[in-house]
């Protein structure tokens, strides 16, 4: 058993039929010695008396809020949560496996630049009685500070018969140099509590590997005389690291109709302009990627050919 | 500790081309190592990230763009002094800081070159003959060093009398390639910045 936060404890259980469970001793946080009784949740049934209560925790019915009283007055609470371990593996029932970039990916993180700011998100089908707490650091043995905000519900989607909820959190490395060469990864730890179930999820990454620039901005078209060619120009996104001559981007320019199966024109360039062939009912799209370290491409920025 | 804006004329920077070739060569070599050594811990997630130049050179600090010198997190206190002549420099316009930056890059290359050559000698003794260093990568390191053209003491190639542990050597190769790729990215950024200034 260990303390998650004040008056909240996590009991780690090997989860299999007829498992013996864990013996837990609860101590009432009071100077009183006599006349103390214990109850669980809203029940008035007295579970025991005395300053300590010894319980055998085997299942979710044994978890919950244990309260010690004296003469009708509440002295203290202890909330017991269960963390299940099945076949030596901690349960991952609360969050959905996003399967990208690989199986067992519960947390996904992205950074728009090298400032040390990043966003992580996760998915669940659970809508109520759900709380998240996020901690992060650079490295684990001698951790350096990363400050994370509160996790918030960022999107709701319908997936078949199920509703899916996306939560996200923003974190910022306390002292980040955009030009630094990372040798220790960022560690992100998410504690998830659903009713009386506790789970934890972790992700480890280098900022350089989770870079995904914002789309290029200010796309403009200039038709070329006596030609079907169009000069398209754009600018670096405002959120990208500066100076741009040091943090350079490369771009992919594509002309395509509404369907992915349609024919297209595509060209890659390090410049902020390119010449392409425009077709009726097609769009010109541009996306960006770090020129020197190939992490993710940005989303497309698009303008219609006409 | 930083690069002032007074640098060579745009497009007149011979090291840019070499640094692009360097990044390409080390990225290709790393990809080849990952594929060939697929049953070894050779991915970014699996290896320890070591920097053989740590406390010996200060390339990131010495080559910091002027715009980042206002960022206190970038101003590490490490300082190293270097020899200050080099052919990538447009002599009259070259600042002392830029010379420091380029000579730090030179020292990095020299250290990695020695490590890679030593490692290759060991890998050539491996009866499995599983992986060798790409001669093109070694040549590109050499070309960039020649373009930088700093006079520097020759670092003797490490020779080892004990029987090489080929498993450890291959893991060390992965560690070295990952670190060198990251340094090659920094070098490319620096050269691009200098070329544009």
């Amino acid at each position: 058993i260990w303390e998650l936060k004040k008056d909240v404890y996590v009991v780690e259980l090997d989860w299999y039929p007829d498992a013996p469970g864990e013996m837990v001793v609860l101590t009432c946080d009071t100077p009183e010695e006599d006349g103390i009784t214990w109850t669980l949740d809203q029940s008035s049934e007295v579970l025991g008396s005395g300053k300590t209560l010894t319980i055998q925790v085997k299942e979710f019915g044994d978890a919950g809020q244990y309260t010690c009283h004296k003469g009708g007055e509440v002295l203290s609470h202890s909330l017991l949560l269960l963390h299940k371990k099945e076949d030596g593996i901690w349960s991952t029932d609360i969050l959905k496996d996003q399967k990208e970039p690989k199986n067992k990916t519960f947390l996904r993180c992205e950074a728009k630049n090298y400032s040390g700011r990043f966003t992580c998100w996760w998915l669940t089908t659970i809508s109520t009685d759900l709380t998240f707490s996020v901690k992060s650091s650079r490295g684990s043995s001698d951790p350096q500070g990363v400050t994370c905000g509160a996790a918030t519900l960022s999107a709701e989607r319908v997936r078949g018969d199920n509703k899916e909820y996306e939560y996200s959190v923003e974190c910022q490395e306390d002292s980040a140099c955009p030009a630094a060469e990372e040798s220790l990864p960022i560690e992100v730890m998410v504690d998830a509590v659903h009713k009386l179930k506790y789970e934890n999820y972790t992700s480890s990454f280098f900022i350089r590997d989770i870079i995904k620039p914002d789309p290029p901005k200010n796309l403009q078209l200039k038709p070329l005389k006596n030609s079907r060619q169009v000069e398209v120009s754009w600018e670096y996104p405002d959120t990208w690291s500066t100076p741009h001559s040091y943090f350079s981007l490369t771009f992919c320019v594509q002309v395509q109709g509404k369907s992915k199966r349609e024919k297209k024109d595509r060209v890659f360039t390090d410049k902020t302009s390119a010449t392409v062939i425009c077709r009726k009912n097609a769009s010109i799209s541009v996306r960006a990627q770090d020129r020197y370290y190939s992490s993710s491409w940005s989303e497309w920025a698009s303008v219609p050919c006409s | 500790r930083n690069l002032p804006v007074a640098t060579p004329d745009p497009g007149m920077f011979p090291c840019l081309h070499h640094s692009q070739n360097l990044l390409r060569a080390v990225s290709n070599m790393l990809q080849k190592a990952r594929q060939t050594l697929e049953f070894y811990p050779c991915t970014s997630e699996e290896i320890d990230h070591e920097d053989i130049t740590k406390d010996k050179t200060s390339t990131v600090e010495a080559c910091l763009p002027l715009e980042l010198t206002k960022n206190e997190s970038c101003l590490n206190s490490r300082e190293t002094s270097f020899i200050t002549n080099g052919s990538c420099l447009a002599s009259r316009k070259t600042s002392f800081m830029m010379a420091l930056c380029l000579s730090s890059i030179y020292e990095d290359l020299k250290m990695y070159q020695v490590e890679f050559k030593t490692m290759n000698a060991k890998l050539l003794m491996d009866p499995k003959r599983q992986i060798f260093l790409d001669q093109n990568m070694l040549a590109v390191i050499d070309e960039l060093m020649q373009a930088l053209n700093f006079n520097s003491e020759t670092v003797p190639q490490k020779s080892s009398l004990e029987e090489p542990d080929f498993y450890k050597t291959k893991i060390k190769l992965c560690i070295l390639l990952h670190a060198f790729r990251i340094r090659a990215v920094t070098i490319d950024r620096v050269m691009s910045y200098l070329n544009a200034s």
């Epitope: 024919k263 595509r266 890659f268 360039t269 009726k280 | -």
Partner: antibody
Framework: QVQLVQSGAEVKKPGSSVKVSCKAS????????LHWVRQAPGQGLEWMGW????????EYAPKFQGRVTITADESTSTAYMELSSLRSEDTAVYYC???????????WGQGTLVTVSS | DIVMTQSPLSLPVTPGEPASISCRAS??????LHWYQQKPGQASRLLIY???QSISGVPSRFSGSGSGTDFTLTISSLQPEDFATYYC?????????FGQGTKVEIK
């Protein structure tokens, strides 16, 4: 199986014109750009121009501008390349090639030898 | 026009050995570079597109690398059917241009 089948060899006099055909099978004809590329004996490849069969849009290499005309007939899934004012240096194998991407070629025809000789 | 220069123009190789063909552009073309294989009397075949992207159906022994002005086609272990002429082609700008070709011959 996508295929491009070209017309047979031609012998032409200097100053005349030649029209080479390229019939596509497999896939929808108008879903692809169609290009013409030539190769003089013992020489490399030389791009001549492209057509979008969907709308008839064309673009030609400046070297051939005014002398080459590329057309397409959707009903027969056939593209044509006509080269006029022939000279001996136009002796070459002419290839048609196509792709859904405009700037490179994933399927090529077998080639048509055009000999220009007096 | 962008001039594409291949080297060597002729490359004698022993079967089973690796082979590398270089292609240089007269100006930077990013990764807008494609490789083709040509055999006498056969339709040309696309091997690699956008410098390093592999094509399904093309053996994995063919790989491409490079960006900017310098590109390489590598055949890791030459098979008898690989003896042919190889061309690079730039698609950075029109007119599309090819290298002069490299003939890979049996040593």
């Amino acid at each position: 199986q996508v295929q491009l089948v070209q017309s047979g060899a031609e012998v032409k006099k200097p100053g005349s014109s030649v029209k080479v055909s390229c019939k596509a099978s497999g896939g929808t004809f108008s879903d692809y750009y169609l290009h013409w590329v030539r190769q003089a004996p013992g020489q490399g490849l030389e791009w001549m121009g492209w057509i979008d069969p969907e709308n008839g849009d064309t673009e030609y290499a400046p070297k051939f501008q005014g002398r080459v005309t590329i057309t397409a007939d959707e009903s027969t899934s056939t593209a044509y390349m006509e080269l006029s004012s022939l000279r001996s240096e136009d002796t070459a194998v002419y290839y048609c090639a196509r792709n859904k991407e405009l700037r490179y070629f994933d399927v090529w025809g077998q080639g048509t030898l055009v000999t220009v000789s007096s | 026009d962008i001039v594409m220069t291949q080297s060597p123009l002729s490359l004698p190789v022993t079967p089973g050995e690796p082979a590398s063909i270089s292609c240089r552009a007269s100006q930077s073309i990013s990764i807008n570079l494609h490789w083709y294989q040509q055999k006498p009397g056969q339709a040309s075949r696309l091997l690699i597109y956008f410098a390093s992207q592999s094509i399904s159906g093309v053996p994995s022994r063919f790989s491409g690398s490079g960006s900017g002005t310098d590109f390489t086609l590598t055949i890791s272990s030459l098979q008898p059917e690989d003896f042919a002429t190889y061309y690079c082609q730039q698609s950075n700008s029109f007119p599309l241009t090819f290298g002069q070709g490299t003939k890979v011959e049996i040593k």
